[in-house]
């Protein structure tokens, strides 16, 4: 998977009036990395691993960048003619990626009230607008405003692309992101299903990177794909991921099943608890 940096900014308006402040989150390699603390008006790292990326350096640069981006987005929202009564939102998502072959990608996307209406490839400067008439109108509004704004010139878009990649490389240089391997904690649980059946669920949590194999085996042999149900691999908020796999088995057959996990070259297998709780015996 490529390394990526993703900025997600949102500004709000109420009855046509743009609200002060903004919401901002930054994801590094798909993990919550920074957020803008509106009380303290500062960029704050999300968890210990994020703090480790910059070590003892301050987050002034990130605070300045996010503040500037938030101000720009508020001005853009002020120029959208669609302002009606009630609450409205304008969201900008900017993503840059560095792939294994060192090629790069950058893009920018605008959403109004949660609906995508304008995208731009920051390398080719090519704009894309969805077919709907509302999206077309909103896109025209925003593009006209961006053209009027002297800052939004060709060089500005190149700079956005370059800045994003520069920041991403700066974070990667710390080595924290590249080096980090956090093995999963694996937990198997059982729950009653229909008469005579139980559902066994295998959960893997707190692992990094996100690539993982998690599958049920019967008599040591992997079950077919269609007899298992998988959860998405999702960030758990601590800079790590979580996922699960479940299958339905006959009660009493637990001893024939194991959950197999493979992650970053390590593996483990996990049995199903029988449901009977017996006192563990110690051998003296």
């Amino acid at each position: 998977e490529p390394h990526s940096l993703r900025y997600n900014l949102t500004v709000l308006s109420w009855d046509g009036s743009v609200q002060s402040g903004f919401l901002a989150e930054v994801h590094l390699d798909g993990q919550p990395f920074l957020r803008y603390d509106r009380q303290k008006c500062r960029a704050k790292p999300q968890g210990q691993w994020a703090e480790d990326v910059l070590g003892n350096k301050t987050w002034d640069r990130e605070t300045r960048d996010l503040t500037g981006n938030g101000k720009d987005l508020r001005m853009t929202l002020a120029h959208i003619k669609d302002q009606k009564e009630g609450l409205h939102s304008l969201q900008e998502i900017r993503v840059c990626e560095i792939h294994e072959d060192n090629s790069t990608r950058s893009s920018q996307h605008f959403y109004y009230d949660g609906e995508l209406f304008l995208s731009q490839n920051l390398e080719t400067e090519e704009w894309t607008v969805p077919q709907s008439s509302r999206a077309q109108t909103l896109a025209m509004n925003v593009r006209n405003f961006l053209k009027e704004d002297a800052m939004k010139t060709k060089t500005h878009y190149h700079a956005m692309h370059a800045d994003c990649l520069q920041e991403l490389r700066r974070y990667l240089e710390s080595g924290v992101v590249l080096r980090r391997t956090v093995p999963p904690m694996v937990n198997v649980t059982r729950s009653e299903a229909s008469e005579g059946n139980i559902t066994v669920t295998c959960r893997a949590s707190s692992f990094y990177p996100r690539n993982i194999i998690l599958t049920w085996r019967q008599d040591g042999v992997s079950l077919s794909h269609d007899t298992q149900q998988w959860g998405d691999v999702l960030p758990d908020g601590n800079g790590t991921y979580q996922t699960w796999v479940a299958t339905r088995i006959c009660r009493g057959e637990e001893q024939r099943f194991t959950c197999y996990m493979e992650h970053s070259g390590n593996h483990s297998t996990h049995p199903v608890p029988s449901g009977k709780v017996l006192v563990l015996q110690s051998h003296w």
């Epitope: 008599d219 040591g220 042999v221 009493g252 001893q255 024939r256 194991t258 297998t269 049995p271």
Partner: antibody, heavy 118, light 107 residues
Amino acid sequence: QIQLVQSGPELKKSGETVKISCKAFGYTFTNYGMNWVKQAPGKGLKWMGWINTYTGEPTYADDFKGRFAFSLETSASTAYLQINHLKNEDTATYFCARNYGNYLFDYWGQGTTLTVSS
Amino acid sequence: DIQMTQTTSSLSASLGDRVTISCSASQGISNYLNWYQQKPDGTLKLLIQYTSLLHSGVPSRFSGSGSGTEYSLTISNLEPEDIATYFCQQYSKFPRTFGGGTKLEIK
């Protein structure tokens, strides 16, 4: 730590019955099945079958159907192998082995030597 | 039943040697193969599961490989405590079957 402790050596005559025990320590007995494996003198290992320690249901390999019986005393975390109508060819060392996921013999007993004389 | 064959019943090697023990199945077993060690006193121990995955506590000088019908166990740097008989076991089908064993001795 996990241990399987088997009963001592047995010397029996043809036609008699023997019951070998295997006591488990260090884990929840009913979470894992128990395998039984035969090793004739100077020979390899032969899987006899296994018993589900949760349901008590035994599964026997074809060569061990009939005179062989697996049983449990769950409260004592003990599995048993009983062989009826002993024959000379039953002379062997018998091992219990924890059945992990019904594919792996991850912990073994020390073996019980059975000698059958005519 | 699936027949497991260990063609070399005994093998002589020197300490520090790299030793490879082979095992072949009468039909493809899709890597569903385990390796066990039996010491001269009869004690049995799991070494490797699923062709190449080392059981916890097993020294890294042991490794396994193979596919289809042909599998092998390698000891990279023979130590005195490795003197034992080694068995392969398939779990692709029931009944579970073992190879005849390969006895490793010191030259």
